[in-house]
């Protein structure tokens, strides 16, 4: 069999949810010797970059400028070290928002709620749309799906506190091109008392944990790694 | 805004040379990656060759990979397109394209990376 490097990972700065015309940046963390990085656009070559010093580097960012539709889609990444090809990364969904109009957001019976109570939101969009999309902020993965005309509802069935904070959601045109954000809907649970102290708040958009974590490899990094890999022989 | 002009196309016999010129207006020349692309008669638009902003680390097609030679010159704003060994299949309309603002020393290989584009300039290679 072939032999290739371990796969890299691809991640987004900030969000994977770009306004339209306004810049995204990926970035693809794989490692310190690598002399190419490649960014691929639903199956085709996008972009090149090529770390300089390569062995002090154990990744790249891929800048997107001017958002738009036809750059929306699936990225993926791999990278090079001498002839030595990677896996490809696993997939990255970028999806461009800010497209077209800003659906409404309500919630039923109300934003104050108990613990318990079944409640629905519903997104409505008189544009021409069939997929709307509800998140909560600092959770911007789990993406709600629900189906309608000009309006779907998102069933939340009975809600404990840990489905407090604030919502928005989009209507969208395929799966990468989403409206503008709806206002927020800041839902408050209350019970489980011995529960409420304990919820944190979430982070608001972008998610916080959405960072590209690419290092410089020091001099003394390397010393140590040195000496690590020289302990590890001796322990031999 | 950016505007791109090429210039430098015309007849050429198989084997000979052309030098392609791309004219950037603006300021935003240096903080621009460049790139060429070409549509043949009949054919979808592919790369050709492209340039990062700073360094000018390059990229090419495989088809043209050792004839053509992408360059830039960030103080007359231009970047160049030096093919040689030229043949009947690289007959086609040529387009520069920038990608503007760009940081790092991305090269950029797909089209709808680019988001500024010139009008073409026709090469045509025949006996």
């Known amino acids: 069999p072939k032999q290739t490097l371990p796969k890299p990972i691809i991640r987004a700065e900030s969000t994977y949810m770009v306004p339209k015309e306004k810049q995204a940046t990926l970035c693809c963390q794989g490692s310190y010797g690598a002399v190419e990085y490649q960014l691929h656009f639903e199956g085709s070559l996008f972009a090149v970059e090529r770390p300089k010093p390569p062995e002090r580097i154990n990744g790249v960012k891929f800048h997107i400028p001017d958002m738009n539709s036809r750059k929306a889609g699936r990225y993926s990444c791999i990278y090079r070290v001498g002839e030595l090809w990677s896996e490809r990364s696993d997939l990255l969904d970028l999806v461009v928002t800010e497209m077209y109009d800003t659906p409404t957001l309500s919630v039923h019976p109300g934003p104050e709620v108990t613990s318990g109570e079944k409640v629905t939101f519903y997104c409505r969009l008189d544009t021409a749309t069939s997929m709307f999309l509800l998140l909560k902020e600092g959770r911007s993965r789990d993406v709600q799906r629900s189906y309608g005309k000009v309006q779907a509802e998102f069933p939340m069935g009975p809600v404990t506190t840990a489905h407090r904070g604030s919502y928005r959601c989009f209507g969208s045109y395929n799966n990468y091109a989403w409206s503008f954000p709806s206002e927020p809907v800041k839902l408050l649970v209350t019970g489980d008392i011995e529960n409420t102290s304990l919820a944190p708040t979430d982070p608001t958009f972008p998610d916080s944990w959405d960072t590209c974590l690419l290092t410089r490899e020091t001099g003394l990094q390397k010393d140590l790694a040195l000496w690590d890999h020289t302990a590890q022989n001796l322990l031999r | 805004e950016v505007q791109l002009v090429e210039s430098g196309g015309g007849e050429v016999q198989p084997g000979g040379s052309l030098r392609l010129s791309c004219a950037a207006s603006g300021r935003t020349f240096a903080s621009a990656a460049m790139g060429w692309f070409r549509q043949a008669p009949g054919k979808e638009r592919e790369f050709v060759a492209a340039?990062?902003?700073?360094?000018?680390?390059?990229y090419y097609a495989d088809s043209v990979k050792g004839r053509f030679t992408i360059s830039r010159d960030n103080a007359k704003n231009t970047v160049y397109l030096q093919m040689s060994s030229l043949r009947a299949e690289d007959t086609a309309v040529y387009y520069c394209?920038?990608?503007?603002?760009?940081?790092?020393?991305?090269?950029?290989?797909?089209?709808?990376?680019?988001?500024?584009w010139g009008q073409g300039t026709l090469v045509t290679v025949k006996p």
């Open positions: 340039i990062s902003r700073s360094v000018g680390d390059t």
């Open positions: 394209a920038a990608v503007v603002p760009t940081y790092g020393n991305n090269i950029y290989v797909h089209s709808a990376a680019y988001n500024y």
